[in-house]
Each structure stands twice: as structure tokens, then as C-alpha cells.
């Protein structure tokens, strides 16, 4: 079975960890595919290791474990994410996460950013 947080949120410009957990007494994981809606994000294979799709290579970092760290989030990243676990001999298991990217708190509060110099 696949266990995952169904709904997660993160701030625009920030990062989020996408994580699915697979548990089985008999099946072994051979490959994990991560997709943003229909678009490939990254693949992990026991034999080949990680491959991040070139479209996302500047924003997606493999890990922790078989999850992904998605960086520099934009509002357009809001949507469904799928992890697909290929197992042997158990078959294919799929998990779904809904990510809501929110405006950063600074933007929401309309705060100006000030830099204060230390007193010397």
C-alpha cells in the first residue's frame, strides 16, 4: 500500500518535500516515477538511481529517500502530483498528493522588506 499526505501547502518561492511511503511484506520496489499532473518530474530506479527530467532539473532535487524536494515554487505548481511505485512481483501502486502553492506571507501582509544595519 501507498501512504502519503493527501494535501500539502507551501509558499510561493519556497520548497516542498513530496513523499510517498510504500509498505509490503513481499514486493520489492524496482522503480518510482514522480509526475506533476501528466508531466514527468523524476524517476528513481534501483538499478540506475535517480534521473530528473530536464524540464525540471533546476528545481527538483531527489530525496529525501524516494521522495522529491521541489524548489522555487510558483503558483502554477499548484495541482496534483503522483508517485508510481513499480514493484516486483507485486505490480504497480500509485499515490496522489495535492499541492497548494500560496502567496508568501510577506506578499499577503503587504509588508515592505527593510534591512537594518547593526549598531557599531
Amino acid at each position: 500500500t501507498i501512504d502519503t499526505k493527501r494535501n500539502i501547502s507551501a509558499e510561493e518561492g519556497g520548497s516542498v518535500i513530496l513523499q510517498c511511503h510504500f509498505s509490503s511484506d513481499t514486493a520489492e520496489v524496482t522503480q518510482v516515477d514522480w509526475k506533476q499532473q501528466d508531466q514527468l518530474l523524476a524517476i528513481y530506479s534501483v538499478d540506475l538511481g535517480w534521473h530528473v527530467a530536464s524540464v525540471f532539473s533546476d528545481r527538483v532535487v531527489p530525496g529525501p529517500s524516494l521522495g522529491l524536494t521541489f524548489q522555487s515554487l510558483t503558483m502554477n505548481d499548484t495541482g496534483e502530483y503522483f508517485c508510481t511505485y513499480h514493484t516486483y512481483p507485486g505490480g504497480i501502486y500509485k499515490g496522489r498528493i495535492f499541492l497548494k502553492v500560496q502567496e508568501s506571507s510577506d506578499d499577503r501582509n503587504g509588508l515592505a522588506q527593510f534591512q537594518t544595519a547593526p549598531l557599531g
Partner: antibody
Framework: EVQLLESGGGLVQPGGSLRLSCAAS????????MHWVRQAPGKGLEWVAS????????SYADSVKGRFTISRDNSKNTLYLQMNSLRAEDTAVYYC???????????WGQGTLVTVSS | DIQMTQSPSSLSASVGDRVTITCRAS??????LNWYQQKPGKAPKLLIY???SLQSGVPSRFSGSGSGTDFTLTISSLQPEDFATYYC?????????FGGGTKVEIK
């Protein structure tokens, strides 16, 4: 550097047999799924067969099922295609191909021509 | 079996032109769609994998888009070395199937 080198092609009569080999180098052969793809003269590409690296799982196109056998020897870094009961429509250039993650073909051999004719 | 239909089957274009080739799958294949370029007497070469990811070493004038059943390969500014035949291929399920090819010729 990844290299795939096919051999074993040639002229064979209908009903005859041929065994193609593909010698792989420059990568960990056992980690990859390997496929055979063919191309008849002046025609498009047709997938023939595949064998997975991790499970050894095998698949064939309907057009060759029961006549062709794909196999691999990971100790020799070699992929094989045993072709029996050959027909004129099997005439083609046969390519071996490396398929990472069972998703895309990132390397192809140069191809070997099989001609089935009397 | 999943049928892949490419269009057009051939086209004539000039250096510098923007060229678009389409590929349609007979059922949804998510993003399991790859594009290859083949020149006469040579093996095919991977251009785009997973519908939109550019293979390492391939010029950025090549791009891919689409998901589900409809996909597009675009060459933003055709170069002399781009005159070739282009194939789409689905890897959603076996048997793997290829489009019929699009031959890009010099106008």
C-alpha cells in the same frame, strides 16, 4: 562511451534461422532494459522485442511471437535475438537499443541487415 | 495496441523556418512519448523524452509539448542539419509503437 554493436545479419532463405548479437560496452549492461527495433527498407520503425534488466521480463511484438526469442548474457554484456521461421516480411535493418527506466531509447546500435529471400 | 498517428507525413521547409510536427495516440499515454530524428543510413537519435524533456546534447531549438493523446515537436528555427525524418514513439505500454514518420525536406 556507450556503444552497441550488432552482428549476425545476412541473407537467409524463407523458413530459415538467424541469430543476431549485440555487444554492449561503456555502461553497466545488466542495469538496463534492452530492446530490438527493426526497419524494413524505406519504411518506418517497428518494435520487435524487449528484455528487462532487473526482472528479466520479456515482451514480443505479435508479428514475431513464437518465432523470435530475445535473451541476454549479462556476464558477456551481450543481447541476442534468435530468429526462426523467417519470412520475407522480416527483411529489415535490426537495431538493438538501450532503454533506461523502460521509458525512452537513449542509445541505438548501427543496425544489422537481415534479408529473407529465396 | 496503441496506434500513433503522425502528421504531416512529409513537409518542405526552408532554413530558418519554424516547423511543427504532431503526433496523436489512439488512447491516453500520459507523457510516455518520445521523439527521434533519423537521417538516411543512420540509426535514430533521441531528441525529446517524456513529451517535453530535451535530451542532453540536443540543441534548444527542438522542443516538445503535450500530454494525454496529442503531442507536438517544434523546431524553432530549422537548420541545414535538421533535414531528416522524425518519429514519435509511445512507451506507455507494450507493444511499443512508433508513428509513421515525418520527412522534413528542403524547399
Amino acid at each position: 562511451e556507450v556503444q552497441l554493436l550488432e552482428s549476425g545479419g545476412g541473407l537467409v532463405q524463407p523458413g530459415g534461422s538467424l541469430r543476431l548479437s549485440c555487444a554492449a560496452s561503456g555502461f553497466t549492461f545488466s542495469s538496463y532494459s534492452m530492446h530490438w527495433v527493426r526497419q524494413a527498407p524505406g519504411k518506418g520503425l517497428e518494435w520487435v522485442a524487449s528484455i528487462k534488466g532487473n526482472t528479466g521480463s520479456i515482451s514480443y511484438a505479435d508479428s514475431v511471437k513464437g518465432r523470435f526469442t530475445i535473451s541476454r548474457d549479462n556476464s558477456k554484456n551481450t543481447l541476442y535475438l534468435q530468429m526462426n521461421s523467417l519470412r520475407a516480411e522480416d527483411t529489415a535493418v535490426y537495431y538493438c537499443a538501450r532503454v533506461p527506466y523502460d521509458y525512452w531509447i537513449d542509445y541505438w546500435g548501427q543496425g544489422t541487415l537481415v534479408t529473407v529471400s529465396s | 495496441d496503441i496506434q500513433m498517428t503522425q502528421s504531416p507525413s512529409s513537409l518542405s521547409a526552408s532554413v530558418g523556418d519554424r516547423v511543427t510536427i504532431t503526433c496523436r495516440a489512439s488512447q491516453s499515454i500520459s507523457s510516455y512519448l518520445n521523439w527521434y530524428q533519423q537521417k538516411p543510413g543512420k540509426a535514430p537519435k533521441l531528441l525529446i523524452y517524456a513529451a517535453s524533456s530535451l535530451q542532453s546534447g540536443v540543441p534548444s531549438r527542438f522542443s516538445g509539448s503535450g500530454s494525454g493523446t496529442d503531442f507536438t515537436l517544434t523546431i524553432s528555427s530549422l537548420q541545414p542539419e535538421d533535414f531528416a525524418t522524425y518519429y514519435c514513439q509511445q512507451s506507455y505500454s507494450t507493444p511499443l509503437t512508433f508513428g509513421g514518420g515525418t520527412k522534413v525536406e528542403i524547399k
